[in-house]
């Protein structure tokens, strides 16, 4: 059963990057408002974003409580504003979201190369360990803290003077690669979770090249 003057939400979509998680839906409301509820498969429905005219709801605070749980959300529609109404007609209309498991589905954010250091024919490239909104003991965990060895980084590197790319992989946040003496190199990294079936890879980081600010060079 539903309420006159309202339409159900549709196109419920999870938008999640590094566990920052927003539920989006349509349509833009006309004389109606929305309330969102979120639940784990075994849990209770918790109301969030009460009576909002937005078509999105930030559910990060809820999903970071246990990123390995599977969540379901639903969006309720209520008549509102200066509409003819003589009391509530049963339960409001609602629509369910797809299931969402943050650990398996959150998009990996674009990584950043924190620094690179050349020592002779070796270059150490360090990837910034992005902070997430997942907490443990009142401190925010990094992406590495959350994913551990499930997360790897792929480094793409090439001589500034050529286009032939080489790759390296690490399950830490550091690479140590061999380079030709006297050559400048460019670097880009990508975060990867090989065990995933969806959203396995991030976009590539911005390119950083030797001879620019980020690096430190020590010829030995």
């Amino acid at each position: 059963s539903g309420t006159t003057n309202t339409v159900a939400a549709y196109n419920l979509t999870w938008k999640s990057t590094n566990f920052k998680t927003i539920l989006e839906w349509e349509p833009k409301p006309v004389n109606q408002v929305y309330t969102v509820q979120i639940s784990t498969k075994s849990g209770d429905w918790k109301s969030k974003c009460f009576y909002t005219t937005d078509t999105e709801c930030d559910l990060t605070d809820e999903i970071v409580k246990d990123v390995k749980q599977t969540y379901l959300a639903r969006v309720f529609s209520y008549p509102a504003g200066n509409v003819e109404s003589t009391g509530s007609a049963g339960e409001p209309l609602y629509e369910n979201s797809p299931e969402f498991t943050p650990y398996l589905e959150t998009n990996l954010g674009q990584p950043t190369i924190q620094s690179f250091e050349q020592v002779g024919t070796k270059v150490n490239v360090t990837v910034e360990d992005e902070r997430t909104l997942v907490r443990r003991n009142n401190t925010f965990l990094s992406l590495r803290d959350v994913f551990g060895k499930d997360l790897i980084y792929t480094l793409y590197y090439w001589k500034s003077s050529s286009s032939g790319k080489k790759t390296a992989k690490t399950n830490t946040n550091e690479f140590l690669i061999d380079v030709d003496k006297g050559e400048n190199y460019c670097f880009s990294v990508q975060a990867v979770i090989p065990s995933r079936t969806v959203n396995r890879k991030s976009t590539d980081s911005p390119v950083e090249c030797m001879g620019q600010e980020k690096g430190e060079f020590r010829e030995i």
Epitope: D44, K46, Y51, Y78, A80, S88, E91
Partner: antibody
Framework: QVQLVQSGAEVKRPGSSVKVSCKAS????????MYWVRQAPGQGLEWIGQ????????NYNENFQGRVTITADKSTSTAYMELSSLRSEDTAVYYC???????????WGQGTLVTVSS | EIVLTQSPALMSLSPGERATLSCSAS?????MYWYQQKPRSAPRPWIQ???NLASGVPARFSGRGSGTDFSLTISSLEAEDFATYYC?????????FGGGTKVEIK
């Protein structure tokens, strides 16, 4: 049907604490936000804070921060509001109230009168 | 915090008369809620989301408004309507209530 039954009237000394209970029935206690609102004699209403019994998530009005603690016991379907460092201005009727259709203050307890007097 | 100012504080009217209660917000809010309270009783939800009558509220009641100005209207007062009415907002934290309008029998 939804019922919220509150504990009886209390008389307290300034500086002491009071703990008011609100026993819920007729619904799944852990699935709904519970709010506390008070009304001083002859005055308007004031939101104190809220709790989601499912996970203990709570929020408080800054005016009461540090003096109020709202808890919930899922095993007995009871919410509690404890107010400390009482002063005469805290004399009021305290209500628990639950979210419902189209309204966050949809169902109300009968109220508990707390009198703070020396 | 949002301050809600209700006017008048007291209305003395006879049964059958029309009553319009006003609620003015210190900043624009999305929706207004109204509660009816009788002596020695808890408030009861009366109008929600500006214009929706709560369950069991007679059709002689209506609510409207937007932004900072909202109103509750009783088209023809009946004996059971004499009570105090409070407006309330939760567009911004903390939720706040107006000081109330008492509708008494003239």
């Amino acid at each position: 049907q939804v019922q919220l039954v509150q504990s009886g009237a209390e008389v307290k000394r300034p500086g002491s604490s009071v703990k008011v209970s609100c026993k819920a029935s007729g619904y799944t206690f852990s699935s709904y936000w519970m709010y506390w609102v008070r009304q001083a004699p002859g005055q308007g209403l004031e939101w104190i804070g809220q709790i989601y019994p499912g996970d203990g998530d709570s929020n408080y009005n800054e005016n009461f921060q540090g003096r109020v603690t709202i808890t919930a016991d899922k095993s007995t379907s009871t919410a509690y509001m404890e107010l400390s460092s009482l002063r005469s201005e805290d004399t009021a009727v305290y209500y628990c109230t639950r979210e419902g259709y189209g309204n966050r203050f949809a169902y109300w307890g009968q109220g508990t009168l707390v009198t703070v007097s020396s | 915090e949002i301050v809600l100012t209700q006017s008048p504080a007291l209305m003395s009217l006879s049964p059958g008369e029309r009553a319009t209660l006003s609620c003015s917000a210190s900043s624009s809010v999305s929706y207004m809620y109204w509660y009816q309270q009788k002596p020695r009783s808890a408030p009861r939800p009366w109008i929600q989301l500006t214009s929706n009558l709560a369950s069991g509220v007679p059709a002689r009641f209506s609510g409207r408004g937007s932004g900072t100005d909202f109103s509750l209207t009783i088209s023809s007062l009946e004996a059971e309507d004499f009570a105090t009415y409070y407006c309330q907002q939760w567009s911004y934290n903390p939720p706040t209530f107006g000081g109330g309008t008492k509708v008494e029998i003239k």
